[in-house]
């Protein structure tokens, strides 16, 4: 059962598994949610104890029954983990705490103009977990405007104390706001040197990378595969760090793989959710339950629905036994990973999918799979929306993309002559325009936010946000697309598609079925040669075939240029302008979304 509310002046008795320090009960709840075993917690505020060393303690708790006895205690705040809930969970904490000092290892001290600058510095420093900033009013002159970057083994403070005229807060890496490079490659036959901070068992290098990503101290890893010669080290995932943040050296080793934490690009790749099945594999751990079920998918579902289950092994049924039902072993461990991995046992193993909701919805895999385009199928582009105007009569105006449960990203030029958001309707999960009838449900627009530097499409800043009046419930046919990560500046996208209901030739009409066309990106230098009369800036991105034939056209404006990278779709461009449609040597020009990520986040998270 999902319980989101906090219980004031209540202490949960017993079940303690760990104690950390957090600046608020809300943050304690997030820490509990991300801990592999925590189901309940009690947070001790200032008034709960005479002893200041006990203030801000967050006691993480577990219980077989998923509940604990409640005791009245003034100043205590208790609650439940969000593991039991179906909603999205984020580790992102943008709060700034006034007159508090979070303690840790102060490894960097520098002057900063503001707490925001200090937080940005922390976010862009590979080691930083949190910071303390001494304001202009701080009594000690030599410490004023000092920004202290801090880290700890656990990522949480070693203590929190009241301190006047300072502010404290966390790194925003988990909010996808880091400018740090994000290295996604996994390097085969490579071991990294440097310090091991921890080790866990993992079935493959990608699970090892995910574990590294949400381990607070892990910056890179080495994984010894099943074929590793030393049996005791097979499936061992070594979590590593170094002073520079990068491996000091690499060693070539057959059957070892190495890679990096994805902490600075966490929002656009699944890092919590290990959805694969591992055949002929047993995961060892503490047994929670054994249930007879039909198939390994049913076993995974059972594990996902059992809040304490972290991973499972399914033993398939013998041919004639038990109506085809096999044994489903639900398991857990202290760190969420198997204590040992055995191969060649005939079992099928995997992990709970409960943690998938800690990943951004945009990373969820969609069904596998415009001028010169072809018709799309339902659910193929679940972020694509059709924006209608009702004045003077109802018609398709522009495309757009879902980027959040209340936010649509589109082009600014779509709103020329639109006096009020009241005349706009956003239709989501639509394949054919003919589906839209008078009684078709739509989302009203609460606010149109146009970039304040926008003048006309050709001069750039052709970007706008629509805030919806109500929130979107995500389903297979309506879900967001990931924004590109700022750490991905060097990525060259090779699988890009433009979609829309726009014209199929210059003099045409809006199409009924959503069209799609695969289009290669064109360098800005090449694009500039094709548009000598315009300035192609770095805030624009171009795409098209030299020979023409496929392109976005009238009515596609505001829609997405979607590119698939590492199995995740990213919103790389917004259809903006071009000379004609699909003309030879006239690529389409799109708003380069990467350059507006800060603007988008500022507006949507204000």
């Amino acid at each position: 059962e999902c319980v989101t509310r906090l219980f004031k002046d209540i202490h949960f008795e017993g079940g303690d598994i760990a104690t950390v320090f957090t600046p608020s009960a809300k943050h304690c709840q997030v820490v509990c949610t991300h801990h592999p075993r925590c189901l309940l917690f009690t947070f001790t505020g200032e008034s709960a104890s005479e002893d200041p060393t006990q203030w801000f303690t967050c006691v993480l708790k577990d219980s077989v029954t998923e509940t604990l006895p409640r005791v009245n205690r003034t100043g205590a705040i208790s609650g439940y983990s969000f593991k039991q809930c179906s909603h999205q969970i984020s580790a992102c904490n943008k709060d700034i705490y006034v007159d508090l000092n979070m303690k840790g290892i102060n490894y960097n001290s520098s002057l900063a103009e503001s707490a925001q600058e200090c937080q940005e510095r922390c976010t862009d420093d590979v080691h930083c977990h949190f910071f303390t900033y001494a304001t202009r009013q701080f009594p000690s002159l030599e410490h004023r405007n000092i920004c202290l970057l801090k880290h700890t083994q656990t990522g949480t403070p070693t203590g929190i104390m009241k301190l006047d005229k300072v502010v404290t807060g966390f790194s925003l890496k988990s909010c996808a706001l880091s400018n740090l490079a994000c290295i996604r490659d996994v390097f085969p036959n490579t071991a990294f040197a440097d310090s091991n901070i921890d080790s866990v068992m993992a079935p493959d290098a990608f699970v090892c990378r995910r574990i590294c990503t949400h381990h607070p101290g892990c910056l890179f890893f080495t994984f010894f595969s099943q074929e590793w010669p030393k049996e005791s080290q097979r499936n061992l995932c070594l979590l590593k760090t170094s002073e520079s943040g990068l491996p000091s050296t690499r060693i070539k080793k057959s059957k070892a793989l190495s890679g990096f934490s994805l902490q600075s690009c966490r929002h656009s790749i699944p890092v919590f959710c290990h959805s694969s099945f591992y055949h002929d594999t047993d995961f060892l751990g503490e047994e929670l339950d054994i249930v007879a079920v039909k198939g390994h998918e049913a076993c995974q579902k059972l594990c996902t629905n059992a809040v304490r289950c972290q991973f499972f092994t399914y033993a398939p049924a013998q041919a004639s036994c038990n109506e085809g039902k096999g044994k489903c072993y639900l398991k857990l461990s202290s760190n969420g990973s198997p204590t040992k991995i055995l191969r060649g046992t005939g079992g099928i193993s995997g992990y709970t999918l409960r943690l998938c909701k800690m990943d951004n919805e945009c990373t969820t895999k969609i069904k596998p799979r415009i001028v010169g385009g072809t018709a799309s199928v339902r659910g193929e582009w679940p972020w694509q929306v059709t924006l209608h105007t009702t004045s003077p009569t109802q018609r398709h105006l522009c495309g757009g993309s879902i980027i959040g449960n209340q936010w649509i990203l589109t082009a600014a030029h779509c709103f020329y002559g639109v006096e009020s958001p009241k005349i706009l309707r956003v239709y989501i999960g639509i394949l054919n325009q003919s589906e839209i009838k008078e009684d078709t449900s739509f989302f009203g627009v609460q606010e149109i936010i146009i970039h304040d530097q926008y003048k006309m499409a050709e001069s750039g800043y052709d970007i706008a946000l629509l805030k919806l009046e109500t929130t979107v419930n995500y389903t297979d046919s309506q879900r967001p697309i990931c924004l590109p990560s700022k750490g991905d500046r060097n990525v060259i996208y090779t699988d890009c598609w433009v979609t829309g209901w726009g014209y199929r030739k210059l003099r045409d009409k809006i199409q009924n079925t959503l069209q799609k066309a695969k289009i290669p990106l064109v360098t800005n230098d090449e694009c500039q040669k094709r548009y000598r009369g315009h300035k192609i800036t770095h805030k624009m991105i171009c795409a098209g075939y030299r020979e023409g034939g496929k392109d976005a056209c009238k009515g596609d404006s505001g829609g997405p240029l979607s590119c698939k990278h590492n199995e995740v779709w990213h919103l790389v461009g917004i259809t903006s302008w071009g000379e004609g449609c699909a003309q030879r040597e006239r690529p389409g020009v799109y708003t380069n979304v990467l350059e507006y990520v800060d603007w988008i986040l500022e507006k949507t998270q204000a």
């Epitope: 290295i183 390097f187 085969p188 990068l246 060693i251 070539k252 080793k253 057959s254 060097n490």
Partner: antibody, heavy 125, light 107 residues
Framework: QVQLQESGPGLVKPSQTLSLTCTVS??????????WSWIRQHPGKGLEWIGS???????YYNPSLKSRVTISVDTSKNQFSLKLSSVTAADTAVYYC?????????????????WGQGTTVTVSS | DIQMTQSPSSVSASVGDRVTITCRAS??????LAWYQQKPGKAPKLLIY???SLQSGVPSRFSGSGSGTDFTLTISSLQPEDFATYYC?????????FGGGTKVEIK
């Protein structure tokens, strides 16, 4: 097929920074299967590895030069570059760029299989 | 750093001769070794990788062997175009290091 071409000044004054660029043609620098390396050869001597870079920006340097070396990559231009600061006459050499194969498609194929023709850099006032 | 010691530093041989060059690593490098050929005024050319694998386009008279610390490059029947300097290179651990070179000269 892939070709590499070094470019940059042939003469550098002592204490200044040596800057060389290697342009990759006939293939993309954007591949996880390669590191892109700089190697130098002093007149009449053997080969000395300076450092390598992966398209992702991951770099490794020779510890004997690390404090003076920066290697960077520009995937959009299909180029990678070498900067060597505070040069002396001892940095006079032929500088080569090379592609270092790092396990192409798992067949354990390794080694520096494509080289530039080399550019002579003289450090002199 | 791993030191790579090549011997001999030069060898005089005739066309048709069998030539063997050895390379010793100061510590074990498994099979992470490559051999290169360099002619005057030219860039090195990869001959052998992974100690014994022949790079495509390289004549089969070139062969490599060894593992751990001791490695050998053999030219089974020396041809006129084989007179050059040969280098071994370890890539087991960064920094990558080369041997001092072996010059194969005409007798």
């Amino acid at each position: 097929q892939v070709q590499l071409q070094e470019s940059g000044p042939g003469l550098v004054k002592p204490s200044q920074t040596l800057s060389l660029t290697c342009t990759v043609s006939g293939g993309s620098i954007y591949s996880g299967a390669y590191y892109w390396s700089w190697i130098r050869q002093h007149p009449g001597k053997g080969l000395e590895w300076i450092g390598s870079i992966h398209y992702s920006g991951l770099t490794y340097y020779n510890p004997s030069l690390k404090s003076r070396v920066t290697i960077s990559v520009d995937t959009s231009k299909n180029q990678f570059s070498l900067k060597l600061s505070s040069v002396t006459a001892a940095d006079t050499a032929v500088y080569y760029c090379a592609r270092d194969v790092d396990d192409s498609s798992g067949d354990e194929h390794y080694g520096m299989d494509v080289w530039g023709q080399g550019t002579t850099v003289t450090v002199s006032s | 750093d791993i030191q790579m010691t090549q011997s001999p530093s030069s060898v005089s041989a005739s066309v048709g001769d069998r030539v063997t060059i050895t390379c010793r690593a100061s510590q074990g490098i498994d099979s992470w070794l490559a051999w290169y050929q360099q002619k005057p005024g030219k860039a090195p050319k990869l001959l052998i990788y992974a100690a014994s694998s022949l790079q495509s386009g390289v004549p089969s008279r070139f062969s490599g062997s060894g593992s751990g610390t001791d490695f050998t490059l053999t030219i089974s029947s020396l041809q006129p175009e084989d007179f050059a300097t040969y280098y071994c290179q370890q890539y087991h651990i960064v920094p990558i290091t080369f041997g001092g070179g072996t010059k194969v000269e005409i007798k």
